[in-house]
């Protein structure tokens, strides 16, 4: 996989009115690396890891990056013209990458209200707009002001690509990301599924890279992929990942059945525990009302396109 | 290439005991169960249970424990099958076998023969 | 235990036939049914797994099929090195089983 680092920023509006704050995120090589509190208007690494990438060196830098990409973002939703009375979110992600053979890709795309609306290869200076009414408004919208916008020129574009893949490389230097292994955690659980069955699930957390192999197998060898179900390996908001697998058997027939997991160059397998039946259960919390502007901006977290 | 490499012939007299070794080379060692089985003379093939070498558990056939014991040193890449209170019905040719995770059995030691006899 | 038959314990053939050693089991086994291959000297080598998946460096005229209680091994076209004896195994329920072997020879 390349090397990225893409910037997530989002701005909102109220009754028309652009909101002062600003969202935003930075991730590096899909992890959680930067955010910017709004506290304390600083950016902040994202756990010890990113906290590592920079050493002893302060995050001014990013500091000032994200205020001022957020001000403009702030300055580039005033000009969207057809905002009706509510909430409205206008959201900028722009990603760089440096992949294997040192070529590199630059993209900037824009989402209004969680649509995307306008892309923008940064290399090739091409944009792309999707096909519906409302986007080609949007888009028309916002290039119209780029293009006024006199710090929006060819050179600009060339900036942030060359500044994205600057502050990439100058993260990859520290070697903290790149020779950075985290070993899963394992742990297998048991719940009731039908009469004589029970569902077993094999959970690998905190991993780091990505790249992981979860299977069950029984008598050692490795089940079909259609009698097991996996889960998305998702970021944990720790600078790692976590990921699950899950398969029926028959109850008393446990001791055949292993969860193998592998992860950079490591291997092991664990057995599903005996005894008392665990049912699991997540509990989902609905929130219906907002109220004030942290609000709408933490609801507004669940939005993002990922 | 994986192979495995059991211990030479074994001569032993009634209510002795044996152990039959079986070292694994070729592949990551605690990847993949190692299996026994045993065949009788001019007979068929009987499992007797499996290992896994990560964390030791293991799996028998009712019908040999007490009989079989299945261990394994991580350091040597080695299997072990430990065979108690020997009598002639233990005479015979007894393997181990590993698998690629896809298939069981998939291959094979060359067999060790242990013969019980006063 | 599930019993597995192979009712023909001994089969002569030419080089260049198509042999079929059937395998039966006393019950349903799911495609669960792996053959093996025991030379004179004792060397044991899987040939098929799963009813009909053929291991890595099996020769194509290998093959197998069936389906719940009944099994099949084929080769296409006899070779010398095929004199050997074929033992069916099922892997659906422990413990395991094998068939009492079909013991191959050239006419």
């Known amino acids: 996989e390349p090397h990225s680092l893409r910037y997530n920023l989002t701005v909102l509006s109220w009754d028309g009115s652009v909101q002062s704050g600003f969202l935003a995120e930075v991730h590096l090589d899909g992890q959680p690396f930067l955010r910017y509190d709004r506290q304390k208007c600083r950016a902040k690494p994202q756990g010890q890891w990113a906290e590592d990438v920079l050493g002893n060196k302060t995050w001014d830098r990013e500091t000032r990056d994200l205020t001022g990409n957020g001000k403009d973002l702030r300055m580039t939703l005033a000009h969207i013209k057809d905002q009706k009375e509510g909430l409205h979110s206008l959201q900028e992600i722009r990603v760089c990458e440096i992949h294997e053979d040192n070529s590199t890709r630059s993209s900037q795309h824009f989402y209004y209200d969680g649509e995307l609306f306008l892309s923008q290869n940064l290399e090739t200076e091409e944009w792309t707009v999707p096909q519906s009414s409302r986007a080609q408004t949007l888009a028309m919208n916002v290039r119209n002001f780029l293009k006024e916008d006199a710090m929006k020129t060819k050179t600009h574009y060339h900036a942030m690509h060359a500044d994205c893949l600057q502050e990439l490389r100058r993260y990859l230097e520290s070697g903290v990301v790149l020779r950075r292994t985290v070993p899963p955690m394992v742990n297998v659980t048991r719940s009731e599924a039908s009469e004589g069955n029970i569902t077993v699930t094999c959970r690998a957390s905190s991993f780091y890279p990505r790249n992981i192999i979860l299977t069950w197998r029984q008598d050692g060898v490795s089940l079909s992929h259609d009698t097991q179900q996996w889960g998305d390996v998702l970021p944990d908001g720790n600078g790692t990942y976590q990921t699950w697998v899950a398969t029926r058997i028959c109850r008393g027939e446990e001791q055949r059945f292993t969860c193998y997991m592998e992860h950079s160059g490591n291997h092991s397998t664990h057995p599903v525990p005996s005894g008392k039946v665990l049912v699991l259960q997540s509990h989902w919390q609905h929130h219906h009302h907002h109220h004030g502007l942290n609000d709408i901006f933490e609801a507004q977290k669940i939005e993002w396109h990922e | 290439e994986v192979q495995l490499q059991q211990s030479g012939p074994e001569l032993v007299k009634p209510g002795a005991s044996v152990k039959v070794s079986c070292k694994a080379s070729?592949?990551?060692?605690?990847?993949?169960?190692i299996y026994w089985v045993k065949q009788s003379h001019g007979k068929s093939l009987e499992w007797i249970g499996y290992?896994?070498?990560?964390?030791?558990?293991?799996v028998q056939n009712q019908k040999f424990k007490g009989k079989a014991t299945l261990t394994v040193d991580k350091s040597s890449s080695t299997a072990y099958m430990h065979l108690n209170s020997l009598t002639s019905e233990d005479s015979a040719v007894y393997y181990c076998?590993?698998?690629?995770?896809?298939?069981?059995?998939?291959?094979w030691g060359q067999g060790t023969l242990v013969t019980v006899s006063s | 235990d599930i019993q597995m038959t192979q009712t023909t314990s001994s089969l002569s053939a030419s080089l260049g036939d198509r042999v079929t050693i059937s395998c039966r089991a006393s019950q349903d086994i799911g495609n669960y049914l792996n053959w093996y291959q025991q030379k004179p000297d004792g060397t044991v080598k899987l040939l098929i797994y799963y009813t009909s998946r053929l291991h890595s460096g099996v020769p194509s005229r290998f093959s197998g099929s069936g389906s719940g209680t009944d099994y099949s091994l084929t080769i296409s076209n006899l070779e010398q090195e095929d004199i050997a004896t074929y033992f069916c195994q099922q892997g659906n329920t422990l413990p395991f089983t094998f068939g009492s072997g079909t013991k191959l020879e050239i006419k």
């Open positions: 290992i896994d070498p990560y964390n030791g558990g293991t």
């Open positions: 070729g592949y990551a060692f605690t990847k993949y169960n």
């Open positions: 076998a590993t698998t690629d995770g896809y298939s069981l059995f998939t291959y």
